[in-house]
């Protein structure tokens, strides 16, 4: 079926919403004087050899688990991720986003990179699709 | 029960290598890092450096850098504190201690024993 | 750096006296509403023990009579009434910045 201007408009609409999170959890954590962040530098993330697609989010949907994780690390009074919420969130609109009609397996890349690095690779694919819908 | 259990007393010589091990049990290792603290003899705590032992990311205090290695096999749960050479000034009791950094805090919980490590020619 | 100064560094006291040791950053170790400070106790040759987390979170297990307490760079830890077991050496600890850093110790000991 081909793409209606209503279809591309949600596409839109889900791929920001995306990419706010994952601009929100980048700014939540990436700070100097964040205690934990040395810390949480130390966990590793798988990365895509390829990203151009949606159809690719599935690699981000298989590191969302240990992305929480890393997210239980970051609470602190004044600043409420709630991590469970939000990754829930994201994988809601990572599996609409990249549909569950065709079955992709994920290659990754052969270095890991940091949560830093992670969101900054995903928040770059996301920025991208979105100029080719606009 | 949680617990690290490290590994025995060591007695060395100026320029010998040197691998002292702290293993944990009755919990996830992976989940949790592994800190090292140096006391020297009649002193205070020093911070050396921290394992992540499910990606073996590792980050060192300064002052510790260059002169220790920190590695983990998380097969066998066991973290690792090693020196390629010793010098008379390593003379310490060495402990690894488990971080705890979920929500509102930051802290060793869990301690091993200590291994003392005493290097004279 | 982070620096930690405890006072005193030692001092003598009587079981059911009430106790108070006090540890100074050189800077706050406060972050978005928490404070990074934590205590521990440490008895000759073995290691130590966490007392307090987060300035003022007692430990599980840890007996209330020890209690923590302070914000940004001053802080406290109080042992209302002392026991026997209680003659150790008391630490603080900075967890805010790295590299963490430890108090000189607090020696209390038997009067």
């Known amino acids: 079926m081909a793409p209606t201007s209503s279809s591309t408009k949600k596409t839109q609409l889900q791929l920001e919403h995306l990419l706010l999170d994952l601009q929100m959890i980048l700014n939540g954590i990436n700070n100097y004087k964040n205690p934990k962040l040395t810390r949480m530098l130390t966990f590793k993330f798988y990365m895509p050899k390829k990203a151009t697609e949606l159809k690719h989010l599935q690699c981000l949907e298989e590191e969302l688990k240990p992305l929480e994780e890393v997210l239980n690390l970051a609470q602190s009074k004044n600043f409420h991720l709630r991590p469970r919420d939000l990754i829930s969130n994201i994988n809601v609109i990572v599996l609409e986003l990249k549909g569950s009609e065709t079955t992709f397996m994920c290659e990754y890349a052969d270095e890991t990179a940091t949560i830093v690095e992670f969101l900054n690779r995903w928040i770059t694919f996301s920025q991208s699709i979105i100029s080719t819908l606009t | 029960e949680v617990q690290l259990v490290q590994s025995g007393a060591e007695v060395k010589k100026p320029g010998e290598s040197l691998k002292i091990s702290c293993k944990g049990s009755?919990?996830?290792?992976?989940?949790?890092?592994i800190e090292w603290v140096r006391q020297m003899p009649g002193k205070g705590l020093e911070w050396m450096g921290v394992i992540n032992p499910g990606s073996g990311g590792t980050y060192y205090n300064e002052k510790f850098k260059g002169q220790v290695t920190i590695s983990a096999d998380k097969s066998i749960s066991t973290a690792y504190l090693q020196w390629s050479s010793l010098k008379a000034s390593d003379t310490a009791m060495y402990y690894c201690?488990?971080?705890?950094?979920?929500?509102?805090?930051?802290?060793?919980?869990?301690w091993g024993q200590g291994t003392t490590v005493t290097v004279s020619s | 750096a982070i620096r930690l100064t405890q006072s005193p560094s030692s001092f003598s006291a009587s079981t059911g006296d009430r106790v108070t040791i006090t540890c100074k950053a050189s800077q706050s170790v406060d972050y978005q509403g928490d404070s990074y400070m934590n205590w521990y106790q440490q008895k000759p040759g073995k290691a130590p023990k966490l007392l307090i987390y987060?300035?003022?979170n007692l430990e599980s297990g840890v007996p209330s009579r020890f209690s923590g307490s302070g914000s940004g760079t001053d802080f406290t830890l109080t042992i209302s009434s002392l026991q026997s077991e209680d003659f150790a050496t008391y630490y603080c600890?900075?967890?805010?910045?790295?590299?963490?850093?430890f108090g000189g110790g607090t020696k209390v000991e038997i009067k």
């Open positions: 009755g919990y996830a290792f992976t989940n949790y890092l």
């Open positions: 600890q900075q967890s805010n910045e790295d590299p963490y850093t």
């Open positions: 987060t300035a003022s």
């Open positions: 201690a488990r971080w705890r950094g979920e929500g509102y805090y930051a802290y060793f919980d869990v």
